[in-house]
């Protein structure tokens, strides 16, 4: 009876289990009743990093100097090339497909440490009482405006991305020593 599943490092084809090709080799022909799977090593600048039945090897990644990339680790028949950025530049992603001078901190985050030749910008979330409404590589989180020091009241609460909105007090204390009595704006305050 033909198998319905195969062992590890095997694959099912034409009702029989064939060996997969090892890393660094590609499939030339499937096994038969009488022959083993035929595999061939990947060529120069090619690789396959898993046990496989691929008929083509993958091309090594090209570290394009025009994008600021250089080879960090040369690829082998079993591993891809690893790129990194020129000194002072930083990868845009883990895959390092392009380089930027430094990354920016998004709204809601402030710069904790400005980038150097060695380390990229370090961002930190703005804590309560602070905000950042810009993308920046140098601006820290800014403190919310203190409405009280301007003799105003908070009309809209601040967030990590927005400042508070201050506005005039609806009712002002009577300056005439009226026992702390609240008076509507414009009444007895000299306002027009």
């Amino acid at each position: 009876e033909p198998p319905t599943a195969c062992r590890e490092k095997q694959y099912l084809i034409n009702s029989q289990c064939c060996s997969l090709c090892q890393p660094g080799q590609k499939l030339v022909s499937d096994c038969t009743e009488f022959t083993e799977t035929e595999c061939l090593p990947c060529g120069e600048s090619e690789f396959l990093d898993t046990w496989n039945r691929e008929t083509r090897c993958h091309q090594h990644k090209y570290c394009d100097p025009n994008l600021g990339l250089r080879v960090q680790q040369k690829g082998t028949s079993e591993t891809d090339t690893i790129c990194t950025c020129e000194e002072g530049w930083h990868c845009t992603s883990e895959a390092c497909e392009s380089c930027v001078l430094h990354r920016s901190c998004s709204p809601g985050f402030g710069v904790k440490q400005i980038a150097t030749g060695v380390s990229d910008t370090i961002c930190e979330p703005c804590p309560v009482g602070f905000f950042s409404n810009v993308s920046s590589a140098f601006e820290k989180c800014h403190p919310w405006t203190s409405c009280e020091t301007k003799d105003l009241v908070v009309q809209q609460a601040g967030t990590n991305k927005t400042d508070v909105v201050c506005g005039p007090q609806d009712r002002l204390r009577d300056p005439g020593g009226g026992g702390g009595r609240l008076v509507p704006r414009g009444f007895g305050t000299g306002d027009p």
């Epitope: 025009n66 994008l67 600021g68 990339l69 392009s98 380089c99 930027v100 810009v134 590589a137």
Partner: nanobody
Framework: EVQLLESGGGLVQPGGSLRLSCAAS????????MWWVRQAPGKGLERVSA????????YYADSVKGRFTISRDNSKNTLYLQMNSLRAEDTAVYYC?????????RGQGTLVTVSS
């Protein structure tokens, strides 16, 4: 296509002054944070100064604080760096950069040499 063209470099004596300019095109200049960075011979990139899109907030590296002033004219799409009290250690190629700056977007830079 982003283009940044730096100018104003040259040979100057220690204690002298220079004003660098950076003419920007290919993007909406007034929307971007801008930076000056420099690379001294045989050394890595140093971030010198930055300015926010409106020109109201700035950053200076400790090495240039009190001597350099960054500014921008959004109507002329131009970034400036006024450099006073220049020292031998300010000798470098100066580049302007937008945020974010991709390697492929960088300008050619302008060489500043401080020497007697």
């Amino acid at each position: 296509e982003v283009q940044l063209l730096e100018s104003g470099g040259g040979l100057v004596q220690p204690g002298g002054s220079l004003r660098l300019s950076c003419a920007a095109s290919g993007f909406t200049f007034r929307d971007y944070e801008m930076w000056w960075v420099r690379q001294a011979p045989g050394k890595g990139l140093e971030r010198v100064s930055a300015i926010n899109p409106q020109g109201t907030r700035t950053y200076y590296a400790d090495s240039v604080k009190g001597r350099f002033t960054i500014s921008r004219d959004n109507s002329k799409n131009t970034l400036y760096l006024q450099m006073n009290s220049l020292r031998a250690e300010d000798t470098a190629v100066y580049y302007c950069a937008k945020l974010p700056t991709y390697f492929s977007d960088r300008g050619q830079g302008t060489l500043v040499t401080v020497s007697s």
